[in-house]
């Protein structure tokens, strides 16, 4: 066996993309490797070139079709292989049977916007991107707000246990700059994980009116 440790992890974005990361201690950076996808009940197969993302980690995206096309379902199984070139032949480094809807990671929410802002409150909305219609309303969200002098890691998480694409932030400080992020997760799938965080949305609360209680 190859010495050290290795890991092969893939996620389906619920529409037409499987993103994979393969890591192995001691593997050479210039090694040429690919991920091959062979569905059990589809006519297509797909390959992507693994590109280095860190010292011993490679990643690639299997693009299965147009971004919003529904290329896989809950009954599909895709056999995924990592193949690396060794001289004139390709060597198998990892194999897994991949159930797409058990291994979901959606795209980060997009189109964040301030709907309404006051001195102590801000209403923000967003949209989900490339999410399957199969989920219907079975999604949850986490949100966080960056306050001045704090880090994202310190920001408390706000959980929305339903498909609610807006939030009303309260108890904010007047005339203060904030940033806001949100992420999404389907309820389905044993190995499903949170999407990446959205791009941060910067907003500023209104100043308190002079001489008035607010």
């Amino acid at each position: 066996a190859v010495n050290g440790t290795s890991q092969f992890t893939c996620f389906y974005n619920s529409r037409a993309n499987i993103s994979c990361v393969w890591s192995q201690d001691g593997a050479l950076q210039d090694t040429s490797c690919q991920v091959h996808a062979w569905p059990d009940r589809r006519r297509w197969n797909q390959t992507c070139e693994l590109l280095p993302v860190s010292q011993a980690s490679w990643a690639c995206n299997l693009i299965l079709g147009a971004p919003d096309s529904q290329k896989l379902t809950t009954v599909d199984i895709v056999t995924l292989r990592v193949l690396c070139r060794e001289g004139v032949r390709w060597r198998v480094m990892a194999i897994q049977d991949f159930k797409p809807f058990e291994n979901l990671r959606l795209m980060a929410p997009i189109s964040l916007q301030v709907v309404h802002v006051e001195t102590h409150r801000c209403n923000i909305s967003w949209e989900i991107s490339q999410a399957s219609h199969y989920f219907e309303r079975h999604l949850e969200f986490e949100a966080r707000t960056l306050s001045p002098g704090h880090t994202w890691e310190e920001a408390p998480l706000l959980t929305l246990k339903q498909k609610q694409e807006w939030i009303c932030l309260e108890t904010l400080t007047p005339d203060t700059q904030y940033e806001f992020q949100v992420r999404v997760k389907p309820l389905q799938g044993e190995f499903t994980t949170w999407s990446p965080w959205s791009q941060p949305l910067a907003f500023r609360t209104k100043p308190a009116a002079l001489g008035k209680d607010t």
Epitope: A1, T79, L80, A94
Partner: nanobody, 121 residues
Framework: QVQLQESGGGLVQAGGSLRLSCAVS????????MGWFRQAPGREREIVAG????????YYDDSVKGRFTISRDNAKNTVYLQMNSLKPEDTALYYC??????????????WGQGTQVTVSS
């Protein structure tokens, strides 16, 4: 947690056959690929064969291709390694392992205790 228990090892003459079994208990057997590794004295643990969980796609090390066959019975939560045309160099402690993907590295998530296979010439 997943528990693995190998059986079927023993002493056999070169050219003979053995069938190893690995009984799996605990979490869902269906969610794991299964593999057989071996370790000879003073050598690294090395992968012999692997089988995926749903399509039963198999992998074999070049040294055992055409001689060994891995199979699984999901109803019995058991994985097998049929070893034919055994050679003295197949002598080793054979381990059953489970993980989410077949990997060439010996860092799989779950392991059995091993069963000894000795091939005499």
């Amino acid at each position: 947690q997943v528990q693995l228990q190998e059986s079927g090892g023993g002493l056999v003459q070169a050219g003979g056959s053995l069938r190893l079994s690995c009984a799996v208990s605990g979490r869902s057997f269906r969610n794991y690929v299964m593999g057989w590794f071996r370790q000879a004295p003073g050598r690294e643990r090395e992968i012999v064969a692997g089988i995926t969980q749903f399509t039963s796609t198999t992998y074999y090390d070049d040294s055992v291709k055409g001689r060994f066959t891995i199979s699984r019975d999901n109803a019995k939560n058991t994985v097998y390694l049929q070893m034919n045309s055994l050679k003295p160099e197949d002598t080793a402690l054979y381990y059953c392992a489970a993980d989410r993907s077949i990997k060439m590295t010996a860092d799989w998530a779950y392991w059995g205790q091993g069963t000894q296979v000795t091939v005499s010439s």
